[in-house]
């Protein structure tokens, strides 16, 4: 005899309001198998029992959460299979505050996820990101959990808020931070992300040929491929238009950090160098995509990074690290810049 449950997973996550059918069936050599669902810690959904099979319909209500067991019997043998059902709610309803960040001052950022279930810290996690990495130096405060005001009875959804105390972002500042909320469920990870733009003051470094002296807000893609790990970051404005860049040094201020130089001649190349005395080495630690796909040359206090064959500049964050000490310098390259050695 054979005993089957479909889907076969022992844990199933069901979005609130969506339905799921779990079919339990058994074939029997000696007569007809008896198959039935039994509810454990759950008010089972509707069950349709046929000869040799039983179909459990889960309606995607919070009351469906639990662990029903299918029992199949055939002659002198019995089989059992349990399915842990978790009904969840995780709409894309993130609210961030403030609407934008101001460099040069300490501030508190909050991020609220609305109408969620389950609302326990084991399932839900918050992160404040710069690119794709957690922002170092941000101090997470105690999360808050409140029940949402519901129109309908019996659906206890919650909102969870995470706050961070940020040190001064410094100038130049990153174009944006992101609040990322992740819900981890059996065999399912869901993520929502909300951008928090950073107000760029007129003292930020600008590329040549930019005539506007007005302050402007920079935005960054919420699917940035690479990330910075520190708060002290050098940026290039990514607001259009994207002027042609001349070779120039782009480095972070600070106590003996490595410096990044950009060369757009014949393709493009980045040079990271340190001038912090003898015994210092530098290496590239981050680039959009896979660092292994870039051409790297490292020689003590200097390290070059380039794309071969020559092509358009890759958009995203580049990072160079200096050892000993571990100081890093970050460079943001906007994607629309294309090397063009023949342009005037």
């Amino acid at each position: 005899q054979s005993f089957q449950v479909n889907p076969p997973e022992s844990e199933v996550a069901v979005a609130m309001g969506t339905s799921l059918q779990i079919t339990c069936s058994m074939s029997c050599d000696e007569g007809v198998a008896r198959v039935h669902w039994r509810g454990l810690d759950t008010s089972l959904g509707s069950v349709q029992t046929l000869p040799g099979s039983s179909i459990l319909s889960v309606r995607g209500m919070l009351s469906d959460t639990g662990t029903p067991v299918c029992v199949g019997s055939c002659g002198s043998r019995s089989f059992q299979h349990s399915v842990k059902i978790l009904v969840y709610a995780f709409p894309d309803q993130l609210v961030v505050s403030p609407e934008f960040l101001v460099p040069g001052q300490d501030q508190v950022v909050s991020c609220t996820a609305h109408n969620i279930w389950p609302a326990d810290p084991n399932s839900l996690s918050f992160a404040l990101l710069l690119g794709e990495q957690r922002l170092e130096g941000a101090q997470a405060l105690e999360p808050e959990q409140e029940e949402e005001i519901q129109e309908a009875e019996g659906t206890p959804l919650f909102r969870m808020t995470q706050r961070w105390r940020l040190p001064s972002l410094g100038t130049p500042a990153p174009p944006a931070l992101h609040c990322q909320v992740t819900m981890q469920l059996p065999k399912l990870v869901l993520t929502h992300r909300k951008e928090i733009p950073v107000l760029q003051s007129q003292t930020s470094p600008k590329p040549p040929n930019t005539t506007s002296a007005e302050p402007y807000i920079l935005t960054s893609s919420s699917t940035a491929e690479a990330v910075s790990t520190g708060l002290n970051i050098t940026t290039l404005p990514s607001a259009p238009p994207y002027p042609k860049l001349s070779p120039r040094t782009l480095s972070s201020e600070g106590p003996c950090r490595p410096k990044i130089h950009q060369d757009l001649e014949a393709g493009w190349e980045l040079l990271c160098e340190a001038s912090c005395g003898p015994g210092v080495t530098v290496r590239w630690t981050l680039a959009p995509g896979d660092l292994a796909t870039y051409h790297k040359r490292e020689a003590g206090a200097q390290a070059w990074l380039s794309v071969l064959p020559p092509g358009p500049m890759v958009e995203g964050w580049f990072q160079c690290r200096q050892d000993p000490g571990g100081e890093v310098t970050n460079l943001y390259v906007p994607g629309q810049v294309t090397p063009n050695s023949s342009s005037t």
Epitope: V71, S76, F79, Q80, H81
Partner: antibody, heavy 120, light 107 residues
Framework: EVQLLESGGGLVQPGGSLRLSCAAS????????MHWVRQAPGKGLEWVAV????????YYADSVKGRFTISRDNSKNTLYLQMNSLRAEDTAVYYC?????????????WGQGTTVTVSS | DIQMTQSPSSLSASVGDRVTITCQAS??????LNWYQQKPGKAPKLLIY???SLQSGVPSRFSGSGSGTDFTLTISSLQPEDFATYYC?????????FGGGTKVEIK
């Protein structure tokens, strides 16, 4: 306090019979599957039989099939094991134990055991 | 019938050691695997049910993992009261079957 208390063990000759009882208290007996598990001296655990919460389903180990009968009386909160045609290899400590829905979730309450010795 | 193969059959360890016991089923049993602890002269005690769920009242140093045919019981930091014999048991189909046991002894 949740408790299971076995009784009825003893010395019996090969071919003889014994009836073991297990008195349950401290939980809703009629909501749980009940098992008998045995352990021969110096050996591991061997499952013997299970009965569903309402008594409608009963399953046995091949080694006892046709000789042992499991039953229950929910009005008395008592589980039974009728053992006939006993053999020397049935000598063991017999435990009664519970599990939700027959057995999937493990046997979470055990009695202290009753000893059955089959010898001439 | 589903055979349960437990290994090792015995092991010697010291207090504070991390101990791992494995159990293999002869066919897929999903997550229907339970672990028990038994001390001499006492009834077994359920530690882990459904492969990885910790039974109420059991210390968190005990954990279970696995699905399908391969399962593991781990004691993260062995305590004096943990020296005992451990059994796995499949609850997927009758006849229910136990592993042969693993005796954890003091080194």
């Amino acid at each position: 306090e949740v408790q299971l208390l076995e009784s009825g063990g003893g010395l019996v000759q090969p071919g003889g019979s014994l009836r073991l009882s297990c008195a349950a208290s401290g939980f809703t007996f009629s909501s749980y599957g009940m098992h008998w598990v045995r352990q021969a001296p110096g050996k591991g655990l061997e499952w013997v039989a299970v009965i569903s919460d309402d008594g409608s389903d009963k399953y046995y180990a091949d080694s006892v099939k046709g000789r042992f009968t499991i039953s229950r009386d929910n009005s008395k909160n008592t589980l039974y094991l009728q053992m006939n045609s006993l053999r020397a290899e049935d000598t063991a400590v017999y435990y009664c134990t519970t599990s939700k829905y027959y057995y999937y979730y493990g046997m979470d309450v055990w009695g202290q055991g009753t000893t059955v010795t089959v010898s001439s | 019938d589903i055979q349960m193969t437990q290994s090792p059959s015995s092991l010697s360890a010291s207090v504070g050691d991390r101990v791992t016991i494995t159990c293999q089923a002869s066919q897929d049993i999903s997550k229907s695997l339970n672990w028990y602890q038994q001390k001499p002269g006492k009834a077994p005690k359920l530690l882990i049910y459904a492969a990885s769920s910790l039974q109420s009242g059991v210390p968190s140093r005990f954990s279970g993992s696995g699905s399908g045919t391969d399962f593991t019981l781990t004691i993260s930091s062995l305590q004096p009261e943990d020296f005992a014999t451990y059994y796995c048991q499949q609850g997927y189909s009758t006849p229910l079957t136990f592993g042969g046991g693993t005796k954890v002894e003091i080194k």
